[in-house]
Amino acid sequence: PKQTLPKPIIRAESTYMVPKEKQATLCCQGSYGAVEYQLHFEGSLFAVERPKPPERINGVKFHIPDMNSRKAGRYSCIYRVGELWSERSDLLDLVVTEMYDTPTLSVHPGPEVTSGEKVTFYCRLDTATSMFLLLKEGRSRDVQRSYGKVQAEFPMGPVTTAHRGSYRCFGSYNNYAWSFPSEPVKLLVTGDIENTSLAPTDPTFPDSWDTCLLTRETGLQKDLALWDHTAQNHHHHHHHH
C-alpha cells in the first residue's frame, strides 16, 4: 500500500453556517513542514496554499469570499510534505444562510415550563421549502430536522433543565442553503431547587470544534500541537447531513 501522511483536520472558523455574501474561513490543520495544502469542494480542487516558509506553521486558513449557494456544500483538505501526500480530511459541511425568507418559531405550551412537561417547537415558513431545522444556541452541530409543507413540529418530549436555552429555526431549501434564522425563543425549564441550581447553563459561544488552532513552531508549541492533533483526530466528531 502507498504510504500516506496522517489526515489533516478541517474546521470552519467561527461557524459552518455562513450568511450569504459574507466570508467563510476554513482551516486545514496538517503538519509543520507541509509545502502545499489543497482545499477540495465536492471532490474537485477549489484552492491551493503553499505556505512560506512551510516549516513554521502547522496549517493554513482558506478564505471563501462572497458566500452563496454555489459555494455551499462539502469541503475537505489534504496536504503534502515533500512528495508525500496526506490522507483526505473528514468532510466539512458548509452552509449558506440568510437565503430568501425568515421563519417564525413558537413553542407549546409556552417558553416557561416545568421539568417533565412535554414541549413542542413549531417552525413556520410560507415559502417553498419542506425541510426545517431547529438549533440550540451553543450546540450548532446538533441540528434537529423535521418536514412539513409550511410548518414543521419538533416534539421535545418531557423536558429537563438540560433543555433550557435559546433556540432558533431555519427553513432549508437544500442541505446547504438555509433561510434567515428565526427570532430566538428562550426556553426556561424550572425543576426542583436542587436540580435548578446545579443544572449547568449552556455556553453561548460556538462549538469548540469550530475554532482554528494553528500554531507557529517553537519547541513547546510543536509538542502541544502534536498532542492537540492526535487528540482532536481521536475525538473529532462531525455532523453529517
Partner: nanobody
Framework: DVQLVESGGGLVQAGDSLRLSCAVS????????MGWFRQGPGKDREFVAA????????YYADSVKGRFFISRDNAKNTAYLQMNNLRLEDTAVYYC???????????????????????WGQGTLVTVSS
C-alpha cells in the same frame, strides 16, 4: 465596478507562442488572486492557471503545465498568460478572472475553481491551426 479586459488573442500556427494580457480596473488589483480559464468549442469552461496576489504561488492545469506561464505586474494592474508550443486543442476563448470579496488574502493562495471568482472578462479568442 470591476472591469477586466483581455487582449492578445488571435490566429496562430501549432507550435507558436502567444501572450495574453488582462487589464483590471475598479478594485485593488495588487491584493487579488487571479486566474485564467478557457472554453473550447462545445466544451465546458476549464481552469488553466492561477496566481496569488504576491506572485509567489502559481498553479497550472495538467494540460498546460510546462507550456503556459502565468504572471502579473501589480504596478500595471495587469495579469498575463504566456502560451508556448500551442496545440490545436488549445483553441478556445480565454477568460481572466479575479477573486471576489475584499479580504486580506494570503500572499500564497491561489483559487482553481471557477465558482471562487466573482469578476470575469469578456474573453479573447485563441485559434490554433495546423
Amino acid at each position: 465596478d470591476v472591469q477586466l479586459v483581455e487582449s492578445g488573442g488571435g490566429l496562430v500556427q501549432a507550435g507558436d507562442s502567444l501572450r495574453l494580457s488582462c487589464a483590471v480596473s475598479g478594485r485593488t488589483f495588487s491584493r487579488l488572486p487571479m486566474g485564467w480559464f478557457r472554453q473550447g468549442p462545445g466544451k465546458d469552461r476549464e481552469f488553466v492557471a492561477a496566481i496569488s496576489w504576491s506572485s509567489s504561488t502559481t498553479y497550472y492545469a495538467d494540460s498546460v503545465k510546462g507550456r503556459f506561464f502565468i504572471s502579473r505586474d501589480n504596478a500595471k494592474n495587469t495579469a498575463y498568460l504566456q502560451m508556448n508550443n500551442l496545440r490545436l486543442e488549445d483553441t478556445a476563448v480565454y477568460y481572466c478572472a479575479a477573486v471576489g470579496g475584499s479580504l486580506d488574502y494570503s500572499a500564497t493562495v491561489v483559487y482553481t475553481a471557477a465558482r471562487a471568482y466573482a469578476d470575469w472578462g469578456q474573453g479573447t479568442l485563441v485559434t490554433v491551426s495546423s
